[in-house]
């Protein structure tokens, strides 16, 4: 299973560039120790990145705003684009050192140059999730899971920026997947591709996963989607009654599922 | 050390409602999943739900929503589940498990026995 | 929900004998982005909590004795004892840690004669 905030569940590979990408513990930033940093990267098939591939990874445009473990017990981040508010207004890997107590607890940094999936858990108030390397074309046979997960209570209200799927009359080729739910099992919602905006959905609970899948074939240009909390005592928590339109398939139905 | 302390032995009368807790040290209250696991007599383990305290998410079993509900104290690094309306299906043995950061529980409370008796 | 089914529901075997146990999946609990199955394995002794023996489905946990090994993937898995001693007088539960909610098999209990 896996997750930003939580490292398994489901669909687990997040930002990544040249084989690195970035972990948090399935409790949020900064709750890994080195040793369960180098456990989880290598219980995924990978192994802590080294300062070299990061830089690697960083040089390709690789950007995260939070302190990882590496190789040797170092820790760092990534900085492509300067900002006041991450690195000190600096690019370049954010070094802090090999730390001499490794049960200081950072995110991690995992190299394993066989990954090829993308998405993550998710539970910020907002994001937009982007089809991978969106503007460009997204790959073949990509399977990309979001899950959002939010506080008991709140819903999610979920809006839909580009489109641009391949289109074919089922949906079978290249598609997005919503589902009500925690996982792609249960409250699906609709399945969804061509270039046509689908409408907006708010969530009946506080999590909801949207799935990317991609076949061998043709590609095209990507998607991006954006989510806002809405908190149990705002007027717009009504979820709209949406009907079939454009080139999806939807499912009036809504399921309560966490 | 990792712990997980939990409370003693409860009796509680038919509809009533219990509040069971899982003392963590400071660091595993924090830094992972506070999950609760219940088991009857001579049967085997039902997931009820996870907390996350450090951010306030809580998962619940679709099963337990109503009759279960998770709650923690920072102050205290103590999880509380609170079980309402009791009946003689609520008697069990209720265990709070630390998850890894791995698929897998890695440590685990020494359980708390709950008697429902009128 | 992922609905965990373990057979047989109990054994009495002899020291020093070989013991295979079943555990199978509703749905797959394979994790298609780094092809780990998300399956753990816990052993229950009388009057204490779960104790874990093997993660990822074949992943044994460390300080576990070798005699233990996990094995499968996708929906079908196994809990394997090469030689069981007489401390191995226990219940034994799969878990799924794939997806909300965790579920357990209902437990294989190994009895020694």
């Known amino acids: 299973w896996g997750f930003k905030n939580g490292i398994f569940h489901n669909s687990i590979w997040l930002e990544q560039a040249a084989g690195v990408y970035h972990r948090e513990a399935r409790a949020g930033r900064y709750k890994l120790t080195y040793a369960e940093a180098k456990a989880v990267c290598e219980f995924e098939g990978g192994r802590l990145a080294t300062y070299k591939q990061l830089e690697a990874a960083r040089k390709i445009g690789f950007h995260v705003c939070a302190a990882g473990w590496m190789a040797k017990g170092r820790v760092g981040y990534p900085i492509v684009k300067p900002g006041p508010n991450c690195g000190f207004g600096k690019t370049g890997i954010i070094d802090y050192g090999i730390r001499l107590n490794r049960s200081e607890r950072w995110d991690a940094y995992c190299y394993n140059p066989h990954a090829k999936e993308c998405g993550g858990v998710f539970t910020d108030p907002k994001r937009i999730f982007k089809s991978p390397g969106f503007p460009n074309e997204y790959d073949d046979n990509q399977v990309c899971y979001w899950h959002i997960r939010l506080k008991y209570g709140q819903r999610i209200h979920l809006s839909f920026l580009d489109f641009d799927l391949e289109h074919d009359p089922g949906c079978l080729a290249d598609y997005v997947e919503i589902y009500d739910s925690y996982d792609d099992v249960h409250g699906f919602v609709g399945r969804y591709c061509g270039d046509e905006l689908p409408e907006d959905i708010i969530s009946t609970g506080n999590v909801m996963t949207l799935k990317f899948l991609s076949d061998a074939s043709v590609t095209a240009g990507g998607f991006q989607i954006k989510y806002v909390t809405v908190d149990p005592a705002s007027k717009s928590s009504q979820a709209k009654n949406t009907s079939t339109t454009g080139n999806k398939k939807f499912l009036p139905g809504r399921f309560s599922h966490l | 050390q990792v712990q997980l302390q939990q409370s003693g032995a409860e009796l509680a009368r038919p509809g009533a409602s219990v509040k069971l807790s899982c003392k963590a040290s400071d660091d595993t209250f924090i830094n992972y999943g506070i999950n609760w696991v219940k088991q009857r007599t001579g049967q085997g383990l039902e997931w009820i739900g996870e907390?996350?305290?450090?951010?306030?998410?809580?998962f619940y079993n679709e099963k337990f929503k109503g009759k279960a509900t998770l709650t923690a104290d920072r102050s205290s690094s103590t999880t509380y589940m609170e079980l309402r309306s009791l009946t003689s299906e609520d008697a069990a043995v209720y265990f709070c498990a630390r998850h890894s950061n791995l698929p897998y529980f890695d440590h685990w409370g020494q359980g708390s026995t709950l008697t429902v008796s009128s | 929900d992922i609905v965990m089914t373990q057979s047989p529901s109990s054994l009495s075997v002899s020291a020093g004998e070989k013991v295979t146990m079943s555990c199978k999946s509703s749905?797959?609990?394979?994790?298609?982005?780094?092809?780990?199955?998300?399956l753990a394995w816990y052993q229950q002794k009388p009057g204490q909590p779960p104790k874990l023996l093997i993660y990822?489905?074949?992943t044994r946990e460390s300080g576990v004795p070798e005699r233990f090994t996990g094995s499968g993937s996708g929906t079908d898995f196994t809990l394997t004892i090469s030689s069981v001693q007489a401390e191995d007088l226990a219940v034994y539960y799969c878990q799924n840690d794939h997806s909300y909610p965790f579920t357990f098999g209902g437990g294989t209990n190994l009895e020694i004669k």
């Open positions: 749905q797959s609990l394979l994790n298609s982005g780094n092809q780990k199955n998300y």
């Open positions: 907390t996350f305290p450090s951010n306030g998410n809580t």
């Open positions: 990822g489905a074949s």
